[in-house]
């Protein structure tokens, strides 16, 4: 049994980091597999992750973590019972992959202006809140080509824009993303989308 | 400096209840592990009684012979944790340790506590008329 | 729940002997034991988890090997600080249990 693609991971900031990794053939990850983790810390405990799998010869495990800091640093030992097949280290703070906003939700009854409102995914005391920024992205469910993408770069988790930017009487739907540029990270997965039937008056036409 | 300290042992009749503490210091009780409870009677083996894990979702486990009577809570903004023990009987009579304890987890919600790395020094309990 | 069998119960040695003390579990339980040490009147030390590891700050003349349902704890060479009594913890979370085993004490 041997490591195939080493166990890359990405960390939340906050309170789980996820592992992926591959093996050279079908493994059952769950019942061969163990991954040891340890922060580099004077009597820190050795925690251990059962692996789900993640494809015929893939593995997965899901770290729990205090709330990171950007020195931590973690040892990662992957086990086959007593046989240690790969050794490392992570460093939650080089990456980092935001947990994804939630609570999308699209207000349409300001007069001729939609307003997208969605939560920050980090509690106040956790440094990522005040630094995220975002990706949101409109389409039509009626129209492949009719995709957009409206950055937010300020830190308030709302988007306005004009109805009439949008085509009326159809039907749109909505996802927001996340991203931290202090600590250069990937972006978050994409929310849970929402769906709104577009309409607004046009306006009457001056002869 | 790190450490684990207990308090509220003492004299209880049969039948009544007491309240344990354990304070932490030196690491947050409210991060990624569990806090348990084993106890020690006069010249017998050690006995786990539970643990309740410190992150966010609080889960606990017990001992089946303490399920019902003895409960494990916390409370994270003063960074202790509890042992409450009802209906005691002589043979509760015992030094009771706090433990910080690593876990085994599979994906998030499955987490059982697993070795005890760091101890209080214990506070005993007597239970006599 | 799990049962622990610790052997032997108490033993007698002198400094610089090696001493061996073996538990076993009642099921498979991997790797999860660790073993401590008790000195009259102190809290248990840990010194060894996942079986084979040593804990932090441990003299290396102590070691432990195993898995599944035999496991031994080592003391290659007997210190006068090391007479003390010795634990094994098997954790088994299919049956939801930590269970201690009774302890070996070592005397000169």
């Known amino acids: 049994m041997k490591v195939l693609q080493e166990p890359t991971c990405v960390s939340d900031y906050m309170s789980i980091s996820t592992c992926e990794w591959k093996m050279n053939g079908p493994t059952n990850c769950s019942t061969e597999l163990r991954l040891l983790y340890q922060l580099v810390f004077l009597l820190s405990e050795a925690h251990t992750c059962i692996p789900e799998n993640n494809g015929g010869a893939g593995c997965v495990c899901h770290l729990l973590m205090d709330d990171v800091v950007s020195a931590d640093n973690y040892t990662l030992d992957l086990w086959a019972g007593q046989q240690l097949l790969w050794k490392g280290s992570f460093k939650p703070s080089e990456h980092v992959k935001p947990r994804a906003p939630g609570n999308l939700t699209v207000h349409t009854n300001v007069s001729d202006t939609l307003l997208l409102t969605w939560s920050n995914p980090y509690p106040p005391d956790n440094y990522l809140y005040n630094h995220l920024t975002y990706a949101v992205n409109i389409w039509s469910e009626n129209d492949p080509a009719d995709f957009r993408i409206y950055n937010v770069t300020y830190l308030e988790p709302s988007l306005r824009i004009a109805a009439s930017t949008l085509k009326s009487g159809i039907s749109y739907r909505a996802r927001v993303r996340a991203w931290a540029q202090c600590y250069n990270t990937t972006w978050s997965e994409w929310s849970p989308s929402t769906k709104w039937h577009n309409s607004y008056r046009e306006p009457f036409e001056q002869h | 400096e790190v450490q684990l300290v207990e308090s509220g042992g003492g004299l209880v009749q049969p039948g009544g209840s007491l309240r344990l503490s354990c304070a932490a210091s030196g690491f947050s009780s409210s991060s990624a592990h569990y806090m348990c409870w084993v106890r020690q009677a006069p010249g017998k083996c050690l006995e786990w009684i539970g643990c309740i894990y410190a992150g966010s979702r609080g889960s606990t486990y017990y001992a089946s012979w303490a399920k019902g009577r003895f409960t494990i809570s916390r409370d994270n903004s003063k960074n202790t944790v509890y042992l409450q023990m009802n209906s005691l009987r002589a043979e509760d009579t015992a030094v009771y340790y706090c433990a910080r304890a690593a876990f085994v987890n599979r994906g998030v919600s499955w987490i059982w506590p697993y070795y005890f790395s760091l101890w209080g020094q214990g506070t005993l309990v007597t239970v006599s008329s | 729940d799990i049962q622990m069998t610790q052997s032997p119960s108490s033993l007698s040695a002198s400094v610089g002997d090696r001493v061996t003390i073996t538990c076993q579990a009642s099921?498979?339980?991997?790797?999860?034991l660790a073993w401590y040490q008790q000195k009259p009147g102190k809290a248990p030390k840990l010194l060894i988890y996942r079986a084979s590891t040593l804990a932090y700050g441990v003299p290396s003349r102590f070691s432990g090997s195993g898995s599944g349902t035999d496991f031994t704890l080592t003391i290659s060479s007997l210190q006068p600080e090391d007479f003390a009594t010795y634990y094994c913890?098997?954790?088994?979370?299919?049956?939801?249990?930590?269970?201690f085993g009774c302890g070996t004490k070592v005397t000169v």
């Open positions: 099921e498979d339980i991997e790797s999860y």
């Open positions: 913890l098997g954790s088994s979370y299919s049956t939801g249990s930590n269970i």
